[in-house]
């Protein structure tokens, strides 16, 4: 018995088509993925064959400005219209808290939504309960196939879930769940979820009686043979894995930002053994046309985001410098003001020893691509970040040893001068650099905010410790030069829309007034 | 829990027809075909034929002219038809899962006078 | 129709050893080889599919290797239970089996 598992992953808001690089589609002609795409191409495998399951392994929510405005809405609505049969909860699913779930996308999805590692408690349980589950028993033709959730743990620290989700052990919590399957006598299990390649490898070794693996959180491009773009593949497509207990446990993921469709078939023999599995991500490209109900509907809900554009946000009542002139040769308020931002986004007190998870930002200067002038009645809209930070990346979280943190800061000023982008804006850090000093010997201090403590203050750098920090996705994926920071992390978890986080802290704060204040002396 | 079982007779005379039912559970003949395998005394197994999930059947070329496999999924049997028996014949007879991943206990049926 | 060759047709062997029985196909099957184990009077019993996925329940000192043509049932330490009749079975094409191999108490 054949099974056809289609699935993407980490869509975050690309509900439009987007250029090869998942920014803006600019020249239609060469734009790729998009909801209305993604529909043909789905409902032409439908057509073609028997037995189909469409799923997604979470973060459907944060990244552009369809989420910023409808909230998680637009997810429910076009899922719904694609017709998927199940989700995964990704750690992005709540950044806008608990009721940023239940109201737009719990309530609203006609699918089930998944995850058996999160458990409910106090007044939240009875709230909650029902409109997620830990699996669900699908029927496909004349068989069944058990789909069971997993979400990250490590949630707490990278949303909004609040206090009365409990967020377990992946593996602790999915056997038992697995093992009720079972007794169900559902031999064909599949483990959805959102957790990053490395667990998911591990649910496929660990996790007794689950026989294929779809997951995301990492972005993981796996692909077998010649790859189609510009994404490097990780291993091939599926990724096997031999489980424990001898069996070959297929592991897939497709990439991020609805770029592919990830395309498994399954051989399943009667005990719902893996008897062979074969595939490929499918490029979304334009080669595939934009199924036009779905796009006429893209349009109309397409307009609302166009207003939203050039409503006020907060006033600034101050000029913020986001020259190059400033901001690649020395601090910047703009970079203060984008960091403070960050580090605003990324509070989350989960242990009373710690104010904050995190207290450090860096920036490399050549991101920020635009000033602000106060001298519009103090005004700030989308549309002016949007060309403060045209790329639509993310803020992401990572840990570095303090070493590296050190190699980042010398790369930051080694060929100073010269305008050039790796300068790197601050926040939580304060540095001295002598620039009469060699390249590579620059750095004369540099000092770090604390975490664990009440009352933040400044500490020097200590090489072997591990430190978190916000920074852009294009430096932790070694942008700018910054390899060492590619090579050398020790985690990397992504985060929100860089626009979004900006917006929000200013939409808080109503009023900024962002100084120069001696982060970069 | 998947298993099989085939039934029939144990005794047929020479010339007649064999007709022996695999009674399926734990699984649906709609999503899965069914393997007919035999083994004469002391020698080696040998393929007959399979029923597929969608109805067609092939056969060993050995048996084509004499073997018939059909089955009634409503009822979860899948029945072979062996005509013009010979002593030859004599053999266990199984069915077996499509992928083999389950086999009936098999039933010995001998061709004698 | 593919040719499945097995070796060796039997063997001695002591409880503790290492048994090796390898099964040569004809053409290219693409891994899909079946071990079986048959006792006298039992059913017969698949032990590993998809050349090296373990069954449920079968003890981890079987171990199935090979592609291509070549393939490999591999019983890392031999216990008494083990003493029984092993066959390949390719379903690549119509089903073909190995001519089996008796594995024996030396």
């Known amino acids: 018995w054949e099974l056809t598992i289609l699935h993407t992953n980490d869509v975050h808001s690309r509900l439009e088509q987007t250029s090869e690089d998942s920014s803006k589609c600019v020249n239609a002609s060469r734009c790729m993925g998009g909801v209305a795409r993604l529909f043909t191409k789905v409902q032409q495998i439908r057509r073609a064959e028997p037995n189909v399951l469409l799923l997604d392994a979470g973060d459907q929510y944060q990244g552009t400005i369809w989420f910023t405005v409808y909230k998680g809405a637009e997810v429910a609505h076009f899922m719904n219209a694609l017709r998927y049969d199940a989700m995964a909860l990704g750690n992005h699913e709540f950044d806008n808290g608990v009721e940023g779930l239940i109201e737009p996308l719990l309530k609203e999805a006609k699918f089930p939504i998944l995850s058996a590692n999160i458990k409910a408690k106090g007044p939240l349980a009875s709230q909650i309960s029902g409109l997620y589950l830990p699996y669900k028993v699908l029927p496909v033709g004349d068989e069944v196939v058990g789909i069971v959730g997993y979400t990250s743990k490590e949630t707490p620290f990278l949303s909004n879930p609040g206090t009365n989700l409990v967020f377990e052990d992946e593996i602790t919590a999915l056997q038992p769940e697995v093992d009720k399957l079972k007794t169900l006598n559902v031999n064909k299990i599949i483990a959805l979820g959102h957790s990053g390649f490395e667990m998911d490898k591990l649910i496929a070794q660990k996790v007794r009686g689950v026989d294929v693996v779809v997951g995301g959180h990492s972005n993981t491009f796996l692909y077998t043979g010649n790859p189609p773009s510009k994404e490097v593949p990780a291993g091939k497509y599926p990724f096997i894995v031999t489980s424990d207990d001898g069996r070959k446990v297929p592991v897939v993921q497709a990439y991020a930002f609805g770029k592919y469709l990830g395309y498994l078939k399954i051989e399943f023999d009667e005990r719902g053994n893996v008897i062979s599995s074969h595939g490929n991500p499918i490029l979304l490209n334009s080669s595939i046309p934009e199924d036009p109900s779905i796009k006429a509907d893209i349009n109309k809900w397409r307009i609302k985001l166009d207003n939203y554009s050039t409503q006020e946000l907060g006033k600034t009542i101050v000029y913020l410098d986001g020259s190059s002139q400033s901001c690649r040769f020395r601090e910047c308020n703009m970079g203060n003001l984008i960091c403070d931002a960050m580090i605003n986004n990324n509070l989350r007190h989960t242990d009373e020893m710690f104010w904050n998870h995190v207290s450090m930002c860096i920036l490399n200067g050549g991101g920020i691509r635009s000033p602000i002038d106060e001298r519009n009645n103090g005004t700030i809209t989308w549309e002016n970040l949007a060309a403060v930070l045209p790329f639509g990346g993310t803020f992401d979280l990572v840990q570095l040893k303090g070493s590296t943190l050190k190699k980042a800061f010398e790369h930051s000023v080694h060929r100073y001068g010269q305008s050039t982008g790796e300068f790197l804006q601050v926040g939580g850090i304060h540095v001295v650099y002598d620039l009469s000093r060699k390249p590579g010997d620059r750095v004369v201090k540099l000092d770090v905010l604390c975490t664990k403590c009440r009352v933040p203050s400044y500490d020097p750098l200590k090489m072997d410790e591990v430190y978190k920090v916000i920074l852009p996705n294009f430096l932790a994926n070694g942008g700018d030069g910054f390899q060492m920071i590619k090579d050398e992390l020790l985690r990397h978890d992504s985060g929100d829309q860089d626009i979004n986080v900006v917006s929000t802290y200013i939409s808080k704060m109503k009023v900024i007034y962002p100084a120069v204040e001696g982060r970069i002396k | 829990e998947v298993t099989l079982k085939e039934s029939g007779p144990v005794l047929v005379k020479p010339t007649e027809t064999l007709t022996l039912t695999c009674t399926v559970s734990g699984f649906s003949l709609s999503s899965y075909g069914i393997q007919w395998v035999r083994q004469p005394p002391g020698k080696l197994l040998e393929w007959l034929g399979v029923i597929w999930s969608g109805g067609s059947a092939d056969y060993n070329a050995a048996f084509i002219s004499r073997l018939t496999i059909s089955k009634d999924t409503s009822k979860s049997q899948v029945v072979l038809t062996m005509t013009n028996m010979d002593p030859v014949d004599t053999a266990t007879y199984y069915c077996a899962g499509q992928y083999g991943s389950v086999w009936g206990q098999g039933t010995l049926v001998t061709v004698s006078s | 129709d593919i040719q499945m060759t097995q070796s060796p047709s039997s063997l001695s062997a002591s409880v503790g050893d290492r048994v090796t029985i390898t099964c040569r196909a004809s053409q290219d099957i693409g891994d899909r080889l079946n071990w079986l184990q048959q006792k006298p009077g039992k059913a017969i019993k698949r032990l590993i599919y998809?050349?090296?996925s373990l069954d449920s329940g079968v003890p981890k000192r079987f171990s199935g290797s090979g592609s291509g043509t070549e393939y490999t049932l591999t019983i890392s330490s031999l216990q008494p239970e083990d003493f029984a009749t092993y066959y390949c079975?390719?379903?690549?094409?119509?089903?073909?089996f190995g001519g089996g191999t008796k594995v024996e108490i030396k």
């Open positions: 998809a050349t090296s």
């Open positions: 079975l390719q379903y690549a094409g119509s089903w073909t």
